[in-house]
């Protein structure tokens, strides 16, 4: 006999990275017929929704109107059908950004390189932080962590055309509080035509994702973001 229901899916709209004082919605998708959803924050019950009619609703939204460092952290959700509870969802790391200062991102030997060249990004921030994050825009992107007193280096090694794209970095004051994003650096990797056609640039977020971070909640893009978010969030942990 089944003791628990399948875990729900949790995500943030428009994004798990939220500029301070902006809004974010945490979505929890369970099953039709769920009579109660619970959102937990850092292990404690945060909010409850009992949708009506439950048989017509399989997703609830928990709205945070004003993001701040107190609201940043790990969220999970569960749902109940009758008296049977689900497994908890995966953890959602909600990050507050635009805290304090803006780092500077640079690339060596430069933003235009030839395939096979060694490339290193440098992220610098003079305020009190020792962890840095380098992000490449795009759904299948990776987040890299780096450490240093005021600067971290991110060696990419010999690059291919797959490394082409737009990069930004953040200083991290803790796992869930990040600086403003750096100005973008667009890396252009030239190679032979055959290689280039085999390695198209990653599909990117809409143009307004960076800087405004999709400030509207009506994007409908979160399922597309899920892969990117999953990668980024694994690195947070």
């Amino acid at each position: 006999q089944q003791q628990t229901l399948p875990k729900p899916f949790i995500w943030a709209e428009p994004h798990f990275m939220v500029p301070k004082e902006k809004q974010v919605t945490i979505c929890c998708q369970g099953n039709y017929g769920a009579v109660e959803y619970q959102l937990h924050f850092e292990g404690s019950l945060f909010a409850v929704d009992r949708p009506k009619p439950p048989e017509r609703i399989n997703k609830v939204q928990f709205y945070i109107p004003d993001m701040n460092s107190r609201m940043a952290g790990q969220y999970s959700c569960i749902y109940r059908v009758g008296e049977l509870w689900s497994e908890p969802s995966n953890l959602l790391d909600l990050v507050v950004t635009e805290m304090y200062d803006t780092p500077t991102l640079s690339v060596h030997p430069g933003p235009e390189v030839i395939s096979g060249e060694k490339v290193t990004f440098y992220c610098r921030l003079d305020t009190a932080t020792s962890m840095f994050l380098l992000l490449k825009e795009g759904r299948s992107s990776h987040v890299q962590r780096g450490y240093g007193k005021v600067q971290a280096e991110f060696p990419l090694g010999p690059v291919t055309t797959a490394h082409r794209g737009t990069y930004r970095c953040f200083g991290s004051y803790n796992n869930h509080a990040w600086s403003f994003p750096s100005e973008p650096v667009k890396l252009l990797v030239t190679g032979d035509i055959e290689n280039t056609s085999l390695a198209p640039e990653d599909p990117t977020f809409p143009a307004d994702t960076w800087g405004t971070y999709l400030l509207t909640t009506e994007t409908g893009l979160q399922k597309d973001h899920a892969l990117w978010d999953h990668t980024a969030q694994n690195l947070l942990r």
Epitope: F41, S44, L45, F46, A47, V48, D49, R50, F62, Y63
Partner: nanobody
Framework: QVQLVESGGGLVQAGDSLRVSCAAS????????MGWFRQAPGKEREFVAA????????YYADSVKGRFTISRDNAKNTVYLQMNSLKPEDTAVYYC????????????????????WGQGTQVTVSS
């Protein structure tokens, strides 16, 4: 923006009942979920009870379940906390809080979920 004013606190004997009220300003009261919290001297503010925008979802702290009842009158812009079988450990300042969720059936349990707070009303239960 909503302003919240609590009233009805006082000094009662253990076992007595008391009803505290929270009046909200403005004409959009029905768009707010409401909660009651309390804070005893030297302790952290703790959740007591909450009511969703439409009143269909209510949620209680285990310590008050079966003794306290939260209700709301959207026509009067007021939320109530009926407290029965009061105990000395219920002594605290009682605060009402409001927030505007997307869902009519949602309530907040954590104080951080709420956007607006009243000044509080003192409830003292003597033994």
């Amino acid at each position: 923006q909503v302003q919240l004013v609590e009233s009805g606190g006082g000094l009662v004997q253990a076992g007595d009942s008391l009803r505290v009220s929270c009046a909200a300003s403005g004409r959009t009261f029905s768009t707010y979920a409401m909660g009651w919290f309390r804070q005893a001297p030297g302790k952290e503010r703790e959740f007591v009870a909450a009511s969703s925008r439409d009143g269909t979802t209510t949620y209680y702290a285990d310590s008050v379940k079966g003794r306290f009842t939260i209700s709301r009158d959207n026509a009067k812009n007021t939320v109530y906390l009926q407290m029965n079988s009061l105990k000395p450990e219920d002594t605290a300042v009682y605060y009402c809080a409001a927030s505007r969720p997307l869902s009519t059936t949602q309530v907040g349990i954590a104080s951080a979920w709420y956007e607006y707070w009243g000044q509080g009303t003192q409830v003292t239960v003597s033994s």
